[in-house]
């Protein structure tokens, strides 16, 4: 049997049954999530569920830039350090950098400090690039 690889929306990239869109627009976390949703297909800010997925994403983004942090779909909506993925994925894989999780930092970004392989918490109102994800 011939199995066709699903296609992603123009400008998005495919990896292991998911499509990813990296947007070099400046949005706060909630506006970024709204924009991801606006693309349809059940898209949300991206969940990152394995080292392999993280490495693939990091390699892709590094081809565009290496200095700007990028919002992902991990947040702490109750502000109690109870982190969850906005797309409902299980929060099992973790890749936090050693930076403090305190203060008013309840949204997660891929940090440019370690080539986008680790995450940092940041204030949700900051305007940053963002990564969307959906399953085609």
């Amino acid at each position: 049997d011939i199995i066709m690889r699903p296609s992603c929306a123009p400008g998005w990239f495919y990896h292991k049954s998911n499509c990813y869109g990296y947007f070099r627009k400046l949005r706060n976390w909630s506006d970024a999530e709204l924009e991801c949703q606006s693309y349809g297909n059940g898209a949300h800010l991206a969940s990152i569920l394995s080292l392999k997925e993280a490495s693939t994403i990091a390699e892709y983004i590094s081809g565009y830039q290496r200095s700007q942090p990028i919002w992902i779909g991990l947040h702490d909506p109750q502000k109690r350090q109870q982190w969850q993925w906005i797309d409902g994925a299980m929060y099992l894989y973790r890749s936090w950098s050693g930076k403090s999780m305190g203060g008013n930092k309840h949204c997660a970004e891929m940090s440019s400090n370690n080539n986008f392989l680790t995450w940092s918490s940041n204030e949700c109102n900051k305007r940053q690039h963002f990564l969307c994800k959906y399953r085609p």
């Epitope: 627009k25 909630s30 506006d31 709204l34 204030e123 109102n125 900051k126 305007r127």
Partner: antibody, heavy 122, light 111 residues
Framework: QVQLQESGPGLVKPSGTLSLTCAVS?????????WSWVRQPPGKGLEWIGE???????NYNPSLKSRVTMSADKSKNQFSLKLSSVTAADTAVYYC???????????????WGRGTLVTVSS | QSVLTQPPSASGTPGQRVTISCSGS????????VNWYQQLPGTAPKLLIF???QRPSGVPDRFSGSKSGTSASLAISGLQSEDEAVYYC????????????FGAGTKVTVL
């Protein structure tokens, strides 16, 4: 009620550096806002210069980026603008403003300083 | 040359309805919300409309905003003498590194 007040020299020599400070009262610059600078040449329209977050993150107008530096001083609850290599074309009223996020999406400048006129002349 | 295009002037008699247009592109109005500012003579700009159609508290409901595609408009119904001012549209622009852009302003005259 948040209030903003610009201060700095009203006269700057050509090729020099324009330096302005915006003092914030009635609110903290450590709040979840951006703090921006906008200028208006005499008789002309508004031009966005750039913005700063309290942690020092900045976004600048691409047309001015090479000459602009912004900083924030949380201890003094103020933020500053430096514009280098000025010419007569930089003569303008300079306003500082607070940018707030909307709950429906987007941002807007909800509080403005009164503005200060800076003239570039020898 | 402003990124957002507004007519330089508009006018009306007291009680009339005046509409100001603001035309942009997919990188600004097309993908971001629009704000409107009022600048009375000799004063700082004042927020009039935010997020396309929202009025801050204290702004009369005579002022309304709308957006469609890459254009936006501000309507002033029941024009009053104190509405004589310059009105600016503004929006975030996603081109280059991202920046905030203003229209050149529309001077509204109450005849």
């Amino acid at each position: 009620q948040v209030q903003l007040q610009e201060s700095g020299p009203g006269l700057v020599k050509p090729s020099g550096t324009l330096s302005l400070t915006c003092a914030v009262s009635g609110g903290s610059i450590s709040s979840s806002n951006y703090w921006s600078w906008v200028r208006q040449p005499p008789g002309k329209g508004l031009e966005w210069i750039g913005e700063i977050y309290h942690d020092g993150s900045t976004n600048y107008n691409p047309s001015l980026k090479s000459r602009v530096t912004m900083s924030a001083d949380k201890s003094k609850n103020q933020f500053s603008l430096k514009l280098s290599s000025v010419t007569a074309a930089d003569t303008a009223v300079y306003y500082c403003a607070r940018d707030s996020p909307s709950y429906s999406s987007g941002w807007y400048s909800d509080y403005w300083g009164r503005g200060t006129l800076v003239t570039v002349s020898s | 040359q402003s990124v957002l295009t507004q007519p330089p002037s508009a006018s009306g008699t007291p009680g009339q309805r005046v509409t100001i247009s603001c035309s942009g592109s997919s990188s600004n109005i097309g993908s971001n919300t629009v704000n409107w500012y009022q600048q009375l003579p000799g004063t700082a700009p004042k927020l009039l409309i935010f997020s396309n159609n929202q009025r801050p508290s204290g702004v009369p409901d005579r002022f309304s905003g709308s957006k469609s595609g890459t254009s936006a408009s501000l309507a002033i119904s029941g024009l009053q003498s104190e509405d004589e001012a310059v009105y600016y549209c503004a929006a975030w622009d996603d081109s280059l590194t991202g920046f905030y852009v203003f229209g050149a302003g529309t001077k509204v005259t109450v005849l």
